[in-house]
């Protein structure tokens, strides 16, 4: 049966049998800035081009043991959520991965900046169709990272990022706080904000919308056919990147403002239990859960 | 995220140092009264002191970025400090990434074309 997260973002008409928009997102390239990935996993083989870009800090700790499957875990799962054959949102989207996070899931602002610059240069050298950049990472507020995101957005690139898993105001983190970036918080199958250990999804006025981010089934780097459940605002952001890819594939001329407006328009409204958020943040936090456009747009989104 | 709202630095730390046109004979000294600012991550464990992103003013050309980076290295060397230019940015933001002692920040903030300097910091998978 269809995983809960795909059901949640799917218009009712498409829930009958299985989630399968045959060519969703095929005109769009999604850049993923994350860990290394297992690009020949059955779920994503042929869909992800691993670029030669790598800018990561050394792993912490003298006894750190670099295990390939662990190094690839986060990125492989997210690539699967965006474009996986069976558990992906935009099954037609092609992806390019840049390694900016090490085997412990840690990177630097400077490495991320250089990665964003790499994408801009690639765009200039070989202009393609619409570009979506997925940034499933967060650090403290960074003026320079936000500025780079702003420049890339002004160059016509759609940036989607994780709100952060700190149960805190997303405005205190980057790139979540960058106004031009689509910032995504995480909700669960009960439309509750996701709790992650003692923390959970970030919130506040810098969040644009929420998306499924708990117990998300996706490609596991443990083996070439394995699946695993992961949770976090990265998974939520990956859903929105997939939805954005499908929207842009259907309407390649959409501006960032129009895309943002459509994402909000088609979202489920007022389904999130706001009691989870601090009282002063409830009015500031958007009560929106991302979804694909309804069946009236069949010709556009499910061609 | 969330367009149409003012930028809020939260508890982001900003240290403003007024530029002074003094030593080192700055051939391209900045206009009087402009300031370059220094920024670092408010979350101490995430800071990466010793690596800095020097962001130059918007219209700065690549050749000027390279020249500014070389100038910083030369001025640092005169003070007995080793520096390493790790990357020169162009395409998105003009500037460069430099590995250097924090002692050189005041010097770096006085360089021509400098808009602001940010200490590198960590980001994490979410």
């Amino acid at each position: 049966s269809i995983p809960w997260n795909l059901e949640r973002i799917t218009p009712p008409r498409y829930r009958a049998d299985e989630y399968q928009p045959p060519d969703g997102g095929s005109l769009v390239e999604v850049y993923l800035l994350d860990t290394s990935i297992q690009s020949d996993h059955r779920e994503i083989e042929g869909r992800v081009m691993v670029t030669d870009f790598e800018n990561v800090p050394e792993e912490d700790g003298t006894r750190f043991h670099r295990q390939a499957s662990k190094c690839d875990s986060h990125g492989t799962h997210l690539a699967g959520v965006v474009s996986g054959r069976d558990a992906g949102v935009a099954k037609g989207a092609s992806m390019r991965s840049l390694r900016v996070l090490n085997c412990q899931g840690k990177g630097t602002v400077s490495g991320t900046l250089i990665g964003l610059e790499f994408i801009r240069k690639s765009q200039l050298v070989q202009p393609v169709g619409p570009l979506v950049v997925l940034l499933p990472l967060a650090g403290g507020y960074s003026r320079v990272l936000n500025a780079a995101c702003q420049r890339l957005a002004r160059a016509g690139v759609v940036l989607v990022t994780a709100a952060g898993n700190f149960r805190d105001d997303a405005c205190l983190y980057s790139p979540a706080s960058a106004p031009e970036v689509i910032t995504v918080g995480a909700t669960n199958a009960q439309d509750q904000p996701v709790t992650l250990g003692t923390l959970g999804t970030n919130f506040g006025r810098c969040v644009d919308l929420f998306a499924p981010g708990e117990d998300i089934i996706g490609a596991s780097s443990d083996c070439s056919t394995c699946f695993v459940s992961q949770s976090g605002t990265s998974q939520a952001a990956a859903h929105v990147a997939g939805i954005a890819a499908m929207m842009l594939s259907a309407e390649p001329e959409l501006t960032l403002a129009e895309l943002r407006q459509r994402l909000i328009h088609f979202s489920a409204k007022d389904v999130i239990n706001e009691a989870w958020f601090p009282e002063d943040q409830r009015v500031l936090t958007p009560n929106l859960v991302a979804a694909l456009p309804p069946s009236t747009h069949e010709n556009l989104y499910f061609q | 995220g969330a367009m149409g709202q003012e930028d809020e630095d939260g508890d982001y730390e900003e240290l403003v140092l007024a530029l002074r046109s003094e030593e080192d004979g700055l051939a391209e000294a900045p206009e009087h009264g402009t300031t370059a600012t220094f920024h670092r991550c408010a979350k101490d464990p995430w800071r990466l002191p010793g690596t800095y992103v020097v962001v130059l003013k918007e219209e700065t050309h690549l050749s000027q970025s390279e020249r500014t980076a070389r100038r910083l290295q030369a001025q640092a060397a005169r003070r007995g400090y080793l520096t390493k230019i790790l990357h020169v940015f162009h395409g998105l933001l003009p500037g460069f990434l430099v590995k250097m002692s924090g002692d050189l920040l005041e010097l770096a903030l006085k360089l021509p074309h400098v808009d602001y300097i940010e200490e590198d910091s960590s980001v994490f998978a979410q």
Partner: antibody, heavy 115, light 109 residues
Framework: QVQLVQSGAEVKKPGASVKVSCKAS????????ISWVRQAPGQGLEWMGW????????NYAQKLQGRGTMTTDPSTSTAYMELRSLRSDDTAVYYC????????WGQGTTVTVSS | QSALTQPASVSGSPGQSITISCTGT?????????VSWYQQHPGKAPKLMIY???NRPSGVSNRFSGSKSGNTASLTISGLQAEDEADYYC?????????FGGGTKLTVL
């Protein structure tokens, strides 16, 4: 263009081993593994397993477990399939194909096991 | 796991349409979006005709189409031509491996 070129035909005695090679070209190697499929005379296709160019990981069909070994050599863009303790019912055409999707196939290698 | 079930043979006249079925279980055909169809002429390597249930690789005639309902996938060939005479195999993911159908011999009368 994307191509998989296999080694030539082999005749082996029962109990011996055979190693078939498959040289890949025209695409990004690490984006796909290699599947191995065999076809006995007059029979259908049988998936034998898969091997990764990215990290050398393997996924063998249950029937093959223990008797077969699949490897890759990224430096020469070549995948290998070795089958040990050959029996007469291993006589077949052995194909390599790109990835699990098997969208591109090698020309096939005939392996005859006969005393 | 056992092979997917296909009819041993089907036939049709030039210009007609034929459909080949491929029946599995919820653990293979019914559980995945990844059913493929291959055409194999005698003495040749198989050729991919349909992938991921409905998609046609570039270069494959639009006379070939795929579909799926529940645990059964189907390949339809419209406007039969003499060169379509061949063996056809379906293939599906299973949880950890891949499984082929037994094959269907298509005869163009």
């Amino acid at each position: 263009q994307v191509q998989l070129v296999q080694s030539g035909a082999e005749v082996k005695k029962p109990g011996a081993s055979v190693k078939v090679s498959c040289k890949a070209s025209g695409y990004t190697l690490t984006s796909y593994g290699i599947s191995w499929v065999r076809q006995a005379p007059g029979q259908g296709l049988e998936w034998m397993g898969w091997v990764s160019f990215y990290n050398g990981n393997t996924n063998y069909a249950q029937k093959l477990q223990g008797r077969g070994t699949m490897t890759t050599d990224p430096s020469t863009s070549t995948a290998y399939m070795e089958l040990r303790s050959l029996r007469s019912d291993d006589t077949a055409v052995y194909y390599c194909a790109r990835g699990y999707g098997m969208d591109v196939w090698g020309q096939g290698t005939t392996v005859t096991v006969s005393s | 796991q056992s092979a997917l079930t296909q009819p041993a043979s089907v036939s049709g006249s030039p210009g007609q349409s034929i459909t080949i079925s491929c029946t599995g279980t919820s653990s293979d055909v019914g559980g995945y979006n990844s059913v493929s169809w291959y055409q194999q002429h005698p003495g040749k390597a198989p050729k991919l005709m349909i992938y991921e249930v409905t998609n046609r690789p570039s270069g494959v005639s639009n006379r070939f189409s795929g579909s799926k309902s529940g645990n059964t996938a189907s390949l339809t060939i419209s406007g039969l031509q003499a060169e379509d005479e061949a063996d056809y195999y379906c293939n599906s993911y299973t949880s950890t491996s891949m499984v082929f159908g037994g094959g269907t011999k298509l005869t163009v009368l």
